[in-house]
Every structure is written in structure tokens, then in C-alpha cells.
Amino acid sequence: AGHLEQPQISSTKTLSKTARLECVVSGITISATSVYWYRERPGEVIQFLVSISYDGTVRKESGIPSGKFEVDRIPETSTSTLTIHNVEKQDIATYYCALWEV
């Protein structure tokens, strides 16, 4: 079974800068899985943000504008990355990655 680790406990960024979060997949080939990213803002329910499927197809939450969140995967390091562009106060949250094993 696959296992996920998010090595960064926290990330502090200056407004308008870029934040890059990592999710390391082990126990399964990352290219054979779909990785999902979610966020939980303080006092709010968890929300889907973006996913990258086993075939590389990216899907985003329909209500979030293109160019805000960028997802990628690096097979060599078995890592999925979530890039948050133009960080602002609305981005303060806990971010989670999840795995769907195909």
C-alpha cells in the first residue's frame, strides 16, 4: 500500500511570493497513482484544490482561477509538488495530499 509524507511541517512566505509544498510517495510507483491536494482553512471544511492523475492529467477545483495552484510530479524523487502562486492571506491553511491507487 502507498504511503504519503509531507516533509514540511510548516511554510512561511511573504505576501505575493511563491510557496512550494511537497508530498513524497512511497510503497507504490507515483506514475501509477493519482495525487490529490486539499486545503483546510481555519474554521472551514476541507476543500479539494487540484489533482494529477496517473496519466498526467491535471484537474482543478472549478471555482479557483487558473494560475493560482500548480501541481506537478517528479517520478525520479517520487514526489508531487503543489505550487501556490502569488501567496496572499486567503492561502493561510493546512494543505494535505492524498493518494488514489489505480
Partner: antibody
Framework: EVQLVESGGGLVKPGGSLRLSCEAS????????MNWVRQAPGKGLEWVSS????????FNADSVKGRFTISRDNAKNSLYLQMNSLRAEDTAVYYC???????????WGQGTMVTVSS | EIVLTQSPGTLSLSPGERATLSCRTS???????LGWYQQKPGQPPRLLIF???SRATGIPDRFSGSGSGTDFTLTISRLEPEDFAVYYC?????????FGGGTKVDIK
């Protein structure tokens, strides 16, 4: 039928203001992020502004920052672009555009023409 | 800002021929965030390709996209009369979202 219909374009003098509207139908407008894209006569496409479904994220091109304001009214299925301090270089067809779950711009309105001239 | 450069500016071909359009980006763009659009005179653009290689709904299979990094290509395998138009690439990986300057495919 999925449709976006823009209105509000016209002739305005430099320094003037204009408010564009876009009415959406055929899809659940309230859950989609929306955009304005413009095209100057005989030129290419230029992204202008984006707004999230709940209006918590708003992004603008540097060329319009401080002058244009994007907004939406989900109850009316409508998107707006308030354009102030208009310049000759703002002359263009303005398109209302939906971005889809894959991130690309999948639904475009027919556009409304804005002409800035004295 | 990511700058997209399309070439050639104009492509003069005959119906039935193969068209190869290039889009180069000033910074590396994940293939998931590159799209292609077709625009005919007096009409709004129409989405052809998203994610570099996936055809949008209703787009015929003579249109195909490929590429990664900074080099992307739109190929029209056999030009039909209705394919003569202007084609734009777009990156939507980060704001500001940017378009290429366009390639006009016209009849030779």
C-alpha cells in the same frame, strides 16, 4: 446551451469609464471561476482579469491594475468589469470567458467592443 | 511573466497538407498547463487542445498537440477548408496567464 453574452461596450473618451457585463446561462455559474480577455483590433489575445467563484481570489494583468475591477453576482449569473481611467490602448473586443476544470478557457462569449477615442 | 513565441507568423498551405505550428515559452511550463485555440475572423477563439495534448470536446482527431518544457507543437494532419484560421497557444500555469502572438494558417 452553454452561453456567455457580453454587453456594455461602446465609445468612450480617454479618461472615461465603462462597465461591461456578462450574463451566463446553461451551466452552474456560481461554481466556476471566470475571466475577461481582450483583443485589440488586428492583434492577439490578452488576458485581463480573473475572479474565483466566491470572489476571494482576484487577479489582474499589470496593464489594468488600479484601473479595472472585476466582480460578479452569482445570484444574477453575471460577471462585470468596471473600467476606469480608460486609455486609447484599451480599445479592444472584450470577451467573457470561463476556465474549465483542466484550467483552459473552454467557453467564450461573442465579445463586446470598447473604443477609447477623443 | 512567461512569454510565448509562436512560429511561423504565417503558414501558407493547401487543403490536404499537414500543418505544424510551434509555440516556445520563455520559462519551462508543465505540459499540463498549455492550451491551443483556433480563431476565425469575427468569431471568438475556440479551445482545441488542453494539457498540451488532450483534445477538447468536439475537436476532430486531425488536430493533435505535443511537447514539453519550453517547446510545444500543434499539428493538423490534413488541412480541411474550415481549418484556415489563426491559432494561439496559452500557458495557464501561473498568473499572469499569457498567450502567444498567433500563427495564421492561410490558403496557398
Amino acid at each position: 446551451e452553454v452561453q456567455l453574452v457580453e454587453s456594455g461596450g461602446g465609445l468612450v473618451k480617454p479618461g472615461g469609464s465603462l462597465r461591461l457585463s456578462c450574463e451566463a446561462s446553461g451551466f452552474t455559474f456560481s461554481i466556476n471561476s471566470m475571466n475577461w480577455v481582450r483583443q485589440a483590433p488586428g492583434k492577439g489575445l490578452e488576458w485581463v482579469s480573473s475572479i474565483s467563484s466566491t470572489s476571494d481570489y482576484i487577479f489582474n494583468a499589470d496593464s489594468v491594475k488600479g484601473r479595472f475591477t472585476i466582480s460578479r453576482d452569482n445570484a444574477k449569473n453575471s460577471l462585470y468589469l468596471q473600467m476606469n481611467s480608460l486609455r486609447a490602448e484599451d480599445t479592444a473586443v472584450y470577451y467573457c470567458v470561463r476556465d474549465d476544470v483542466f484550467g483552459a478557457f473552454d467557453i467564450w462569449g461573442q465579445g463586446t467592443m470598447v473604443t477609447v477615442s477623443s | 511573466e512567461i512569454v510565448l513565441t509562436q512560429s511561423p507568423g504565417t503558414l501558407s498551405l493547401s487543403p490536404g497538407e499537414r500543418a505544424t505550428l510551434s509555440c516556445r515559452t520563455s520559462q519551462s511550463v508543465s505540459r499540463s498547463y498549455l492550451g491551443w485555440y483556433q480563431q476565425k475572423p469575427g468569431q471568438p477563439p475556440r479551445l482545441l487542445i488542453f494539457g498540451s495534448s488532450s483534445r477538447a470536446t468536439g475537436i476532430p482527431d486531425r488536430f493533435s498537440g505535443s511537447g514539453s518544457g519550453t517547446d510545444f507543437t500543434l499539428t493538423i494532419s490534413r488541412l480541411e477548408p474550415e481549418d484556415f484560421a489563426v491559432y494561439y497557444c496559452q500557458q495557464y500555469s501561473r498568473s499572469p496567464l499569457t498567450f502567444g502572438g498567433g500563427t495564421k494558417v492561410d490558403i496557398k
